[in-house]
Amino acid sequence: NYANGKNNVPRLKLSYKEMLESNNVITFNGLANSSSYHTFLLDEERSRLYVGAKDHIFSFNLVNIKDFQKIVWPVSYTRRDECKWAGKDILKECANFIKVLKAYNQTHLYACGTGAFHPICTYIEVGHHPEDNIFKLQDSHFENGRGKSPYDPKLLTASLLIDGELYSGTAADFMGRDFAIFRTLGHHHPIRTEQHDSRWLNDPRFISAHLIPESDNPEDDKVYFFFRENAIDGEHSGKATHARIGQICKNDFGGHRSLVNKWTTFLKARLICSVPGPNGIDTHFDELQDVFLMNSKDPKNPIVYGVFTTSSNIFKGSAVCMYSMSDVRRVFLGPYAHRDGPNYQWVPYQGRVPYPRPGTCPSKTFGGFDSTKDLPDDVITFARSHPAMYNPVFPINNRPIMIKTDVNYQFTQIVVDRVDAEDGQYDVMFIGTDVGTVLKVVSVPKETWHDLEEVLLEEMTVFREPTTISAMELSTKQQQLYIGSTAGVAQLPLHRCDIYGKACAECCLARDPYCAWDGSSCSRYFPTAKRRTRRQDIRNGDPLTHCSDLQHHDNHHGHSLEERIIYGVENSSTFLECSPKSQRALVYWQFQRRNEDRKEEIRVGDHIIRTEQGLLLRSLQKKDSGNYLCHAVEHGFMQTLLKVTLEVIDTEHLEELLHKDDDGDGSKTKEMSSSMTPSQKVWYRDFMQLINHPNLNTMDEFCEQVWKRDRKQRRQRPGHSQGSSNKWKHMQESKKGRNRRTHEFERAPRSV
């Protein structure tokens, strides 16, 4: 599963340019006076994506984000000056960075921002119905944002607004030291975690908050916070980070004497995401970056997807781990972590645990405790001194479902879509990175549905410049993905079946659960459609089984074979470029001598060097002339991509061309020129670097001389010039548009 083989590379890799050209990305490149498009709120009902940014809140149309409304919500000049005088950066810190954006009720949103290190909140009217088209700030009513938004824009807030109450994990002070989980708004007194107690929270960084029911009784509902924090001394030797899941009961109103206006049901457990390493030492991915909850039929048991990175600066890696809520609950019902003093190791608590068990929500379900204020002193005391569980939560199958350690990027965000395919449901992950790319990954069962293998379908660059993806939302209704970064917002479809190709096999090889071969094209798969007409194989991506009745080999279904003629010079080198669209495909070359039917496999050696981009033929001989066939082989299916006819020009021929008197009739040049076809392409740079002819310093010199004569001939015979010039122009364009593997910095042939 972790081998960095072909399965670990994206099958398709699309640059930003390619995404734009194929209309697969829509970007909002931000406003000149804004940035930090990090806070997302998806409203499928109104078909809007609300985005909180620097001094602005946006309302984007989910169909097309180019259509948007905006609210400007800056801070006053006074506030900005106070912030500046406090030694903060006027551009990066002394502004109103929106950190909280939540649905408050049917008609309003609740928004909070840093307010230039003076957190502030207000309500935003959005109307009852989508057609109301209302989007306005309630500027007559501002509230203190302390305990809701951080002061510092660099810090995140994890928040959740339910039943008019805001749960938020954030820093509650100017210095960014007093981190807490708060409940504010509503009619009750604000509640928070215990202050100045590192056993509860130790310099945490909050990721997200989610309401998850515990039973069918809403009194048992819990709010779960995901965060990372410094490991407490004794938990780990040296400074380390731990990923955490924390729980609190929705109906926690604090204690009656101890923990007054503090959570009495707060518990936390470590989330493990690691792989076994050499010497029995596990490699841990501890820096939790993002969490996504995939809802199941049972609302009590969503699947938790977590994105993690390594803490090490030397070894950079990312992983995705999946957790089940039953495992989480099992840990919260297990032993509490206990130690007798700061110099002692943490051990599982062996003593008597008070009743009701700390962390249990007061309800009719569990013993009739009406409120946390009714809990006996021993429960509160125990809860105060034992906020952490001893056992960690291990991922499903005890290992990550995906890791990446061999790349120059790290994962930052994740959203997951559950897709109905021909043979069951598949979870498709969209993973954001710190270089502005999105990975599309599908979890495919190997032998069983429990043993998953990750198939990396695509790597898409969604922003022009490399930028950290800091927010992602997925609209199942619109079948679109929305991505946020400092630079702006991007929108892309969840599926683009047509990009896979025009043949059944190509569609099948793609292994995209969204797509299937419908008999004539690769298109969106709908489970309701007639099954017999749909071809799909997500599990194995085997076209031989699923498409064999349609095509036994290749090129039968609209796949036009590209043909080219290339001229090489004897004793020099030439490059035959061929790179399949799929990075998973293996390239297989065959050679066919002139006037022969027999094809032979090309043997690589000193004379022929194989590169990722194609074949490099060194020290060309006349016998190298012939047809070169480039095939892509993937999962047993072979497709011919290209037929290159190589003509090797002998040295004598070349000498004639070079040393012929300028006034000569140029017949040889004419012969060479006229034999070229529009699909030709000469790789001049490879010639320049590798040619070694006694009378020729560079291929450029050769070309210059050919062109000089050609120009002379055109002057002498004006009627001939047009065709030749167009011929070369076509070649130039065909080079530009050929495919992503062609290095953009390589010089194309100059027009003749």
């Epitope: 009656h256 004497r257 008597r352 008070p354 009743y355 009701p356 009719k364 013993g367 009739g368 405790f369 009406d370 009714d374 809990l375 006996p376 002193d377 021993d378 005391t381 125990f382």
Partner: antibody
């Protein structure tokens, strides 16, 4: 004024049963934990049982567990202690007490239970 | 269970004198300790809650201190009505337990 009045004490044979009652007044009964504490003749105090506000859960020491049952009727402002399988060592004055979540702030005058053959 | 040990078992003092009663817990109980006074033929009465919190209606001469395992009840100037038995009780964890009592008698 807070008042707690116990009743139901008396003489009972070993193995027998008895039900004590405590009528509460002067405070919102359903807002407090309630407890029973006993004192054997010439001895110290011993906690017997505590019931939470709703009546949904109760606590007991090992010495009376499975033999004594505390209950309450919030609509009648009354606390009960059902005692069965009584032993000679259960002979004591039984006090009805307000509290048990924290300190026990109000005590009744007590009712005497004598277990003897 | 948590065992509370009171000392001395009996304390003989004269009115006007200062009384210092001790209660020691077998394990740390924070400040979850309460003091009661019981006179012959009467029910106990709460004097101090949570180690040091005074109770309304209780004279100011009664005060409590301590936390963890060692606690003290102090009566600054004894009055004739103060001669009684004093009990400490822990509310830290079930089962709740009482100390054996200290009998304060007139010398």
């Amino acid at each position: 004024e807070v008042q707690l009045v116990e009743s139901g004490g008396g003489l009972v044979q070993p193995g027998g049963s008895l039900r004590l009652s405590c009528a509460a007044s002067g405070f919102t009964f359903s807002s407090y934990y309630m407890s029973w504490v006993r004192q054997a003749p010439g001895k110290g105090l011993e906690w017997v049982s505590t019931i939470i506000k709703s009546g949904g859960y109760a606590y007991y020491p090992d010495s009376v567990k499975d033999r004594f049952t505390i209950s309450r009727d919030n609509s009648k402002n009354t606390l009960y202690l059902q005692m069965s399988s009584l032993r000679a060592e259960d002979t004591a004055v039984y006090y009805c007490v307000r509290g048990g979540q924290g300190a026990m702030d109000y005590w009744g005058q007590g009712t005497t239970v004598t277990v003897s053959s | 269970e948590i065992v509370l040990t009171q000392s001395p078992a009996t304390l003989s003092l004269s009115p006007g004198e200062r009384a210092t009663l001790s209660c020691r817990a077998s394990q740390s109980i924070g400040d979850y300790l309460h003091w009661y006074q019981q006179k012959p033929g009467q029910a106990p009465r709460l004097l101090i809650k949570y180690a040091s919190q005074s109770i309304s209606g209780i004279p100011a001469r009664f005060s409590g201190s301590g936390s963890g395992t060692d606690f003290t009840l102090t009566i600054t100037s004894l009055e004739p009505e103060d001669f009684a038995v004093y009990y400490c009780q822990q509310g830290y964890s079930f089962p709740y337990t009482f100390g054996g009592g200290t009998k304060l008698e007139i010398k």
